[in-house]
């Protein structure tokens, strides 16, 4: 019996087609992805093959103005239109709190939404009961297939699930649910979830009875043969893991942003054992036409976005200096504003010992692309912020050793004075440079804001200590020459859309007046 698994993950509200780098589509003839194009390919496969499942491994939420405006209603609507068969909850599905998951998505999806390792307690337990499930048995042709869901247990640090959801260890939570499926004589079981490629592989190895793992969170690109675009494969597709009980378990993921449609063919014997598995992600490029009816629907929904982008989010009573002349040479108040917004967006009081789990922000000055003049009645719009942060990036959470941070700050000024983008703006950090010293030895003081303290204060950076830092995904990926961050980071979790973080902060503050206050000094 043959099953075709089509899968997406980490789509991050890319409902419209995008450029090759998953930013806003500029030249339509070279654009990729989007739900209209995805629908064309899915329907083509559904017509050609008998047993097809379309699955999503989480993080549909967050990433473009679509999510900012529609808050998840767009996810339910277009996933329903594409007739997804199941979805696992990702960490970003909790970005607007549990209510922001329940109302627009859990109540509106016409397909099951899954997670076995999220347990509700207190008053939420009855409210959310039945709206998401640990597993689902799906009819496929004349057979049934079990799907068991899982979500990163780091979600309380990455999003806003509140205090009434407990995120358990994935493997511990999955095993009894898989066992339950086995007692129901379901012998073909897919683990669908959002904990990253390393956990996907562990699940394949450790959870008895799981036949296939379809993952997300780490934006992992797997491919067999010559890759069709810029993404470099982390391994073959499918990635085969040998389980502790000796089975060959295929593990797949399909990069991110709806650029690819994962395509995996699995052959099962009559006892539900995997005989063979093969496939590859399908690049959704312009050779695949956009479905006209879905495209028309997208255009209808788009109207509200255009209206939103010119509405006032808040006011500034000071000039927001985002000029290259400032932000690439010294502390600029636009950099301070953005870093303060980044920290504010990551406030999670999850431990009595810590006022917050993260206090530090770094931001490449070259990523700040425009100032905002206060003389336009002080008005700040989404459109204004899109000029400041035009690249459609995310502000991510990483863990780094102090020694890596020190290298990053040395890199920040290694060729100071040439208006290069690597000069770092900061939050929760006080840095002093001495430019008379040779490159690589110019940081003379680097103090960081404590987290395990009731009264935050600045202490000298410790080289061997592990710190959490919020930074743009561009830096996490080694951009602007910050190779040491990419090479030495100990953990990396994708965060919220950059403009969304700043716009939310401005809306919350209502009136802003960021200052230059001595975060960056020269001796």
């Amino acid at each position: 019996w043959e099953l075709t698994i089509l899968h997406t993950n980490d789509v991050h509200s890319r409902l419209e087609q995008t450029s090759e780098d998953s930013s806003k589509c500029v030249n339509a003839s070279r654009c990729m992805g989007g739900v209209a194009r995805l629908f064309t390919k899915v329907q083509q496969i559904r017509r050609a093959e008998p047993n097809v499942l379309l699955l999503d491994a989480g993080d549909q939420y967050q990433g473009t103005i679509w999510f900012t405006v529609y808050k998840g209603a767009e996810v339910a609507h277009f996933m329903n239109a594409l007739r997804y068969d199941a979805m696992a909850l990702g960490n970003h599905e909790f970005d607007n709190g549990v209510e922001g998951l329940i109302e627009p998505l859990l109540k509106e999806a016409k397909f099951p939404i899954l997670s076995a390792n999220i347990k509700a307690k207190g008053p939420l337990a009855s409210q959310i009961s039945g709206l998401y499930l640990p597993y689902k048995v799906l009819p496929v042709g004349d057979e049934v297939v079990g799907i068991v869901g899982y979500t990163s247990k780091e979600t309380p640090f990455l999003s806003n699930p509140g205090t009434n959801l407990v995120f358990e260890d994935e493997i511990t939570a999955l095993q009894p649910e898989v066992d339950k499926l086995k007692t129901l004589n379901v012998n073909k079981i897919i683990a669908l979830g959002h904990s990253g490629f390393e956990m996907d592989k562990l699940i394949a190895q450790k959870v008895r009875g799981v036949d296939v793992v379809v993952g997300g969170h780490s934006n992992t690109f797997l491919y067999t043969g010559n890759p069709p675009s810029k993404e470099v494969p982390a391994g073959k597709y499918p990635f085969i893991v040998t389980s502790d009980d000796g089975r060959k378990v295929p593990v797949v993921q399909a990069y991110a942003f709806g650029k690819y449609l994962g395509y995996l063919k699995i052959e099962f014997d009559e006892r539900g054992n995997v005989i063979s598995s093969h496939g590859n992600p399908i690049l959704l490029n312009s050779s695949i036409p956009e479905d006209p009816s879905i495209k028309a629907d997208i255009n209808k929904w788009r109207i509200k976005l255009d209206n939103y982008s010119t509405q006032e989010l808040g006011k500034t009573i000071v000039y927001l200096d985002g000029s290259s002349q400032s932000c690439r040479f010294r502390e600029c108040n636009m950099g301070n504003l953005i870093c303060d917004a980044m920290i504010n967006n990551n406030l999670r009081h999850t431990d009595e010992m810590f006022w917050n789990h993260v206090s530090m922000c770094i931001l490449n000055g070259g990523g700040i692309r425009s100032p905002i003049d206060e003389r336009n009645n002080g008005t700040i719009t989404w459109e204004n912020l899109a000029a400041v942060l035009p690249f459609g990036g995310t502000f991510d959470l990483v863990q780094l050793k102090g020694s890596t941070l020190k290298k990053a700050f040395e890199h920040s000024v290694h060729r100071y004075g040439q208006s290069t983008g690597e000069f770092l703006q900061v939050g929760g950090i006080h840095v002093v440079y001495d430019l008379s010293r040779k490159p690589g030895d110019r940081v003379v003081k680097l103090d960081v804001l404590c987290t395990k303290c009731r009264v935050p204060s600045y202490d000298p950076l410790k080289m061997d200590e592990v710190y959490k830092v919020i930074l743009p995904n561009f830096l996490a990926n080694g951009g602007d020459g910050f190779q040491m961050i990419k090479d030495e980071l100990l953990r990396h979790d994708s965060g919220d859309q950059d403009i969304n973080v700043v716009s939310t902060y401005i809306s919350k503050m209502k009136v802003i007046y960021p200052a230059v206050e001595g975060r960056i000094k020269f001796s």
Partner: nanobody, 124 residues
Framework: ALQLVESGGGLVQPGGSLRLSCEVS????????IGWFRQAPGKEREGVSC????????YYADSVKGRFTISRDNAKNTVYLQMNSLKPEDTGVYYC?????????????????WGQGTEVTVSS
């Protein structure tokens, strides 16, 4: 919370008719496939009929084809099972069940939400 409540069961003579109702609360009916199942004393639960979320597709077990009709009134959040030409072998507890998805099924394993059941006895 999601709830399904069956009603309309009772004692009926062979050849007679009954109309079972299943009222759902806590969710929007048109997002769910609905199935009717029955369990005769000492037997396995068996699928009788099911209706897709849109109501566009309906399926019946061979044993009831031509005699039973499933219908739904999404506005009233209620699903009905019209049972005609009843036979003694139709006796049992009738359950209505629901699940989200695109493909209606008579396989009990795919249903996530169940009612408490209503008893039907066909006897002279």
């Amino acid at each position: 919370a999601l709830q399904l409540v069956e009603s309309g069961g009772g004692l009926v003579q062979p050849g007679g008719s009954l109309r079972l109702s299943c009222e759902v609360s806590g969710f929007t009916l048109d997002y769910y496939n609905i199935g009717w199942f029955r369990q005769a004393p000492g037997k396995e639960r068996e699928g009788v009929s099911c209706s897709s979320n849109s109501g566009g597709s309906t399926y019946y077990a061979d044993s009831v084809k031509g005699r039973f009709t499933i219908s739904r009134d999404n506005a009233k959040n209620t699903v009905y099972l019209q049972m005609n030409s009843l036979k003694p072998e139709d006796t049992g507890v009738y359950y209505c069940a629901a699940y989200r998805g695109w493909h209606p099924s008579l396989d009990a394993r795919v249903y996530d939400y169940w009612g408490q059941g209503t008893e039907v006895t066909v006897s002279s």
